[in-house]
């Protein structure tokens, strides 16, 4: 059997026998274009493609539409994989989305959506989510139905105020909504009463800025 040399996601890498977490090269669907991603091969059976990670504030997430489209940061640390790749990938097959959260008191929680995809750029990478379970709130902190993606230079939210400019970071803002995992990073003891921090309302309420976040996807049939 010929060995697979290109992989569209971390699930394919895992199934090929490469089961160590780390940076791998993925290929855009129906293309030869490549992108580097962090693969989590340990959490919940492995095979997770990490699409977002925050941990220390080392990377500026107040970026342009183009940067969020193409991705930025380092897959070994804080990064955004890229809306275009995620849109193309999740448009091909059914994916689940897992969001892992850490607070400053040592607690961890997660939200799992059993179907996740991003629409194309022509639809402003609108997010589609169904089937929420997990420990980070019974209600989705990403507004439903899904919103268009907004950045500081591309305002597609439902608020006259330009949420991305005011709250910092690119996100699927509503008006402005109960979450923003790409908000400003605040260190410990400066992380409460912050309207523009890393927010997941239905776990920590309003004004609490989280310590670490990871968004990861995997095929639903993995």
């Amino acid at each position: 059997k010929e060995e697979q040399t290109t992989f569209r996601d971390c699930a394919e890498i895992f199934k090929s026998g490469l089961t160590t977490s780390g940076i791998y090269t993925l290929t855009f669907p129906n293309s030869t274009e490549e992108i580097k991603a962090y693969c989590d091969m340990d959490v919940g059976g492995g095979g997770w493609t990490v699409i977002q990670h925050r941990e220390d504030g080392s990377v500026d997430f107040q970026r342009t539409w183009k940067e969020y489209k193409e991705g930025f940061g380092s897959p070994l640390g804080e990064y955004w994989l890229g809306n275009e790749f995620v849109s193309q990938l999740t448009g091909q097959h059914r994916y689940v989305l897992k969001i892992q959260l850490k607070d400053w008191e040592g607690n961890e929680a997660h939200s799992l959506y059993d179907h996740f995809y991003l629409a194309g750029e022509e639809s402003n990478y609108r997010i589609h989510l169904t089937g929420l379970t997990g420990t980070a709130g019974k209600i989705s902190s990403i507004s439903q139905p899904g919103s268009d993606f907004s950045t500081k230079d591309s305002d597609n939210d439902k608020c006259i105020c330009k949420c991305s400019q005011m709250l910092s970071g690119g996100w699927w803002f509503d008006a402005c909504g109960p979450s923003n995992l790409n908000g400003q990073y605040y260190p410990q003891k400066q992380n409460t009463n912050k309207f523009n921090g890393i927010k997941w309302y239905y776990w920590k309420g309003s004004g609490y800025s989280l310590k670490a976040t990871t968004m990861m996807i995997r095929p639903a049939d993995f």
Partner: antibody, heavy 118, light 107 residues
């Protein structure tokens, strides 16, 4: 429509306690925090702090730490402000105001007048 | 704490006038400024948030502008129901602080 209805005027003596209520309607109570604002007679507005209606955690401005307490009755969509050991300088109108994402007070109660006099 | 200064405590204008109320801050607040209206009966309403964003239901004759430490609220065509006291408020840093208010009266 969104409404915040506060309890009626209070006349108290120094040293007594007062508890003001603010009943919310027209929205999901736990989705928005609640601010409290003081206005002394003939004066401007002063922010006292806010309570996170989802977690129940209060935050007090420095001038309102000690004798002041914010609380909730979530099942009744009601926030409370309690002032203990009342002083003459607590004579004021107290407003509750809905907190929208931590950056604005978008709807206000009608205010509750508290008079402290011996 | 961030100090908010509304230098004009009262202002007289005629119906139909264009009125500007100013507010300055003791340090830069990155446009994190709101404007509130308090009617003579004590009722308080949000008018403008994030310096220039009009709250829902507020007439378009109200507008806000500014940056850094200097901000203003403009009423383009004064109407009788605009008689009120106007307060600016910053949310750049806790505690939230308000200006002293500008009372608007009809000439």
């Amino acid at each position: 429509q969104i409404q915040l209805v506060q309890s009626g005027p209070e006349l108290k003596k120094p040293g007594e306690t007062v508890k003001i209520s603010c009943k919310a309607s027209g929205y999901t109570f736990t989705n928005y925090g609640m601010n409290w604002v003081k206005q002394a007679p003939g004066k401007g507005l002063k922010w006292m702090g806010w309570i996170n209606t989802y977690t129940g955690e209060p935050t007090y401005a420095d001038d309102f730490k000690g004798r002041f307490a914010f609380s909730l009755e979530t099942s009744a969509s009601t926030a409370y402000l309690q002032i203990n050991n009342l002083k003459n300088e607590d004579t004021a109108t107290y407003f509750c105001a809905r907190d929208h994402d931590g950056y604005l007070m978008d709807y206000w109660g009608q205010g509750t007048s508290v008079t402290v006099s011996s | 704490d961030i100090q908010m200064t509304q230098t004009t405590s009262s202002l007289s204008a005629s119906l139909g006038d264009r009125v500007t109320i100013s507010c300055s801050t003791s340090q830069g607040i990155s446009n994190y400024l709101n404007w509130y209206q308090q009617k003579p009966d004590g009722t308080v309403k949000l008018l403008i948030f994030y310096t220039s964003s009009l709250h829902s239901g507020v007439p378009s004759r109200f507008s806000g502008s500014g940056s850094g430490t200097d901000y203003s609220l403009t009423i383009s065509n004064l109407e009788p129901e605009d008689i009120a006291t106007y307060y600016c408020q910053q949310y750049s840093k806790l505690p939230y602080t308000f200006g002293g208010g500008t009372k608007l009266e009809i000439k």
